[in-house]
């Protein structure tokens, strides 16, 4: 472990096409990859009318894009699916939009998934 | 452990499409990216663009924007790398690798364009 | 985004240290620790050497050692053994926000 770092050791797992993709729908994911490697957790979603559907949750590659950061904030201006990731355990529970472009108030408010 | 197979060679005329696949397995597909990289002959390495595997949202390199099409099918852990209106400067191995990190790479497909 | 400049080709004997230099723009290489390094013998996919600057895979022996100074990565190999002659790329991180670019290659020949 390098010090300073959070290490991703396991993350909120979600799966909505779980029946299809033979997974279970919910629980917590143990991260496994190269020992050389970073960890980190993952959450997407979409926004259909201003409902929140999630689409999945889990563990994340080595990617530079989720270094040191501890919340899932996905940043890129109106995606089509929204994606966030972060370092440290289960840190995907909570993720929220932010778009980068924006200069208002952004519309989301930080979301505390409850899976139907 | 970790592998990616690419499908097989293809020779295709100038002018039409041809269409790579890249089947993962060994590892969750959806939880990092696909990248695609070329090689002609006897020439360097060239990044096409990328594909994250969970959301499907992709990045192409300028050159081959409009051109290049990359898709992802997580019910079967396969991305694809389309490449239309093929010209002779196009004969290339085409590679997938995953991750931003290029850590694993699949054993590549040559595309020969051809009339 | 333009590609990385190598030189084309260097030489060593065996036993001894050939260093491959990267040079890139500070939006590139001088801005974030994210160059890899790959080896490719002919006919063969490349095989990462090095990413992240300096961290290197399992697997890879400790001879292979990455580093960077501005705009400038560096490889080093240590202990030239005939097996390392082949191409060496530079390239960076691909995924995100970040567009991926390779160097043209650099040929290593073990004299």
């Known amino acids: 472990a390098i010090l300073g770092r959070s290490e991703t050791q396991e993350c909120i797992f979600y799966n909505a096409n779980w029946e299809r993709d033979r997974t279970n729908r919910t629980g917590v994911e143990s991260c496994y990859g190269d020992k050389d490697k970073r960890r980190h957790c993952f959450a997407t979603w979409k926004n259909i009318s201003g409902s929140i559907e999630i689409v999945k949750q889990g563990c994340w590659l080595d990617d530079i894009n989720c270094y040191d950061r501890t919340d899932c904030i996905e940043k890129k201006d109106s995606p089509e699916v929204y994606f966030c990731c972060c370092e440290g355990s289960m840190c995907n529970e909570r993720f929220s939009y932010f778009p980068e472009m924006e200069v208002t108030q952004p519309t989301s408010n930080p979301v505390t998934p409850k899976p139907p | 452990q970790v592998q990616l197979v690419q499908s097989g060679a293809e020779v295709k005329k100038p002018g039409s499409s041809v269409k790579v696949s890249c089947k993962a397995s060994?590892?969750?597909?959806?939880?990092?990216?696909i990248n695609w990289v070329r090689q002609a002959p006897g020439q360097g390495l060239e990044w096409m663009g990328t594909?994250?595997?969970?959301?499907?949202?992709?990045s192409y390199a300028q050159k081959f924007q409009g051109r290049v099409t990359i898709t992802a099918d997580t019910s079967t852990s396969t991305a694809y790398m389309e490449l239309s209106s093929l010209r002779s400067e196009d004969t290339a191995v085409y590679y997938c690798?995953?991750?931003?990190?290029?850590?694993?790479w699949g054993q590549g497909t040559l595309v020969t364009v051809s009339s | 985004q333009s590609a990385l400049t190598q030189p084309r080709s260097v030489s060593g004997s065996p036993g001894q240290s050939v260093t491959i230099s990267c040079t890139g723009t500070s939006s590139d290489v001088g801005s974030a620790n994210y160059v890899n390094w790959y080896q490719q013998h002919p006919g063969k996919a490349p095989k990462p050497m090095i990413y992240?600057?300096?961290r290197r895979p399992s697997g890879v022996p400790d001879r292979f050692s990455g580093s960077k100074s501005g705009n400038t990565a560096s490889l080093t190999i240590s202990g030239l053994q005939a097996e390392d002659e082949a191409d060496y790329y530079c390239g960076t991180f691909a995924g995100g926000k970040y567009y991926g670019v390779f160097g043209g290659g650099t040929k290593l020949t073990v004299l």
């Open positions: 060994g590892y969750t597909f959806t939880s990092s990216y």
């Open positions: 690798a995953r991750g931003g990190w290029f850590d694993y």
């Open positions: 992240g600057v300096s």
């Open positions: 594909i994250n595997a969970v959301s499907g949202s992709t």
